[in-house]
């Protein structure tokens, strides 16, 4: 039976949420963000084998065409299905303020 | 000046909409779709260099971390930003029906 969450490549090899520890300098934010000084960035990393966490019909099509024409059509890609919001304390023209960003941290992942 | 739509790799090399001509057999649909017999599949293909069609803040983060840790963090990926709906005439248990799919054909592309 098809199982969209069982990785045929082995544990942890397929599309899933990873956490990467990054400084403001790593992120290129040091000139406009004051806090936090470090971020636990959640992002989607891993392979997208056939039928694994397919986001939609388009992902199915893409996988089928990739198998037929691998040099023309790439395999589906592991990307965020949704995001967790996060606040940054940032410098602006008018001073320092708290800003909420809705699209900073991946919440869960799928293959598109 | 930054230009999110100018491809630094040369014309047509960066993330954009491509059309791939496919039969029902190519798509693996021959056993459940009656019409159309061929589909002009629009999909997103191409590289995602820095600042090119970045979908959101997450894409910027991913690119910055990819440059720092290319073996750990992949580059952003070219995926649909939106879809065009399409109707399929399909076989069902009770006969034939027309079904609209909202997520079959990519309408435009961005890097995530």
């Amino acid at each position: 039976a098809r199982n969209g969450d069982r990785c045929p490549l082995g544990p942890g090899r397929c599309c899933r949420l990873h956490t990467v520890h990054a400084s403001l300098e790593d992120l290129g934010w040091a000139d406009w963000v004051l806090s936090p000084r470090e971020v636990q960035v959640t992002m989607c990393i891993g392979a997208c084998p056939s039928q694994f966490r397919e986001a939609n019909m388009h992902a199915q099509i893409k996988m089928n065409l990739h198998r037929l024409k691998p040099d023309t059509v790439p395999a589906p890609c592991c990307v965020p299905a949704s995001y967790n919001p996060m606040v940054l304390i940032q410098k602006t023209d008018t001073g320092v303020s708290l800003q909420t960003y809705d699209d900073l941290l991946a919440k869960d992942c799928h293959c598109v | 000046a930054r230009n999110g739509d100018r491809c630094p790799l040369g014309p047509g090399r960066c993330c954009r909409l491509h059309t791939v001509h496919a039969s029902l057999e190519d798509l693996g649909w021959a056993d459940w779709v009656l019409s159309p017999r061929e589909v002009q599949v629009t999909m997103c293909i191409g590289a995602c260099p820095s600042q090119f069609r970045e979908a959101n803040m997450h894409a910027q983060i991913k690119m910055n971390l990819h440059r720092l840790k290319p073996d750990t963090v992949p580059a952003p990926c070219c995926v649909p930003a939106s879809y065009n709906p399409m109707v399929l005439i399909q076989k069902t248990d009770t006969g034939v029906s027309l079904q609209t799919y909202d997520d079959l054909l990519a309408k435009d592309c961005h890097c995530v």
Epitope: L34, S35, P36, N84, P85, M86, V87, L88, I89, V96, S97, L98, T100, L104, L105 | -
Partner: antibody
Framework: QVTLKESGPGILQPSQTLSLTCSFS??????????VSWIRQPSGKGLEWLAH???????RYNPSLKSRLTISKDTSSNQVFLEITSVDTADTATYYC??????????WGQGTTLTVSS | DIVMTQSQKFMSTSVGDRVSVTCKAS??????VAWYQQKPGQSPKGLIY???YRYSGVPDRFTGSGSGTDFTLTISNVQSEDLAEYFC?????????FGGGTKLEIK
Amino acid sequence: QVTLKESGPGILQPSQTLSLTCSFSGFSLTISGMGVSWIRQPSGKGLEWLAHIYWDDDKRYNPSLKSRLTISKDTSSNQVFLEITSVDTADTATYYCVRAGWDFFDYWGQGTTLTVSS
Amino acid sequence: DIVMTQSQKFMSTSVGDRVSVTCKASQNVGTNVAWYQQKPGQSPKGLIYSASYRYSGVPDRFTGSGSGTDFTLTISNVQSEDLAEYFCQQYNSYPWTFGGGTKLEIK
């Protein structure tokens, strides 16, 4: 817009437990980096930070009062709570709840006054 | 705990003058210092974050400076509405601590 409002008993007797509620609106305590602190100020004196609760339920306390303090939250009802056990006259003060993004205090409540008296 | 010392409890100044409120940390806190203004009968309000950055909407006559252990809040062209108490605070490490406050009186 962002608002925070503290509520409490007003008057307590020594050795009783103080229960404070901070009701807020205009932001969510589910967002990464968001938090709420409790800070108190005896009349005519300085500010004392008591406790902080983060979006992920991480809690921080002032060590000088830690054994008496409990901070908690109810994100669905947009409330943060502080309990102080065994109050004494030294706990007489105005208690403020304050919104903080990470360590950036940007919105303060109007404060609620507690008097401890026998 | 890090002790924040505001040695001057009271300062007197005149409208139009320039005044500097100082704050000393008992150990290095980098630039992790904020300043707050509390007018009589009101809640405190943020003025300066990260030692030198004004909160959004704070007039530019308020300036913060310093790093390590010595910090200064300078008010240039003092206005009558600046009558208030000013507190420094460190957020470099827990417990977050405040200075004792400096009351600004307008002559």
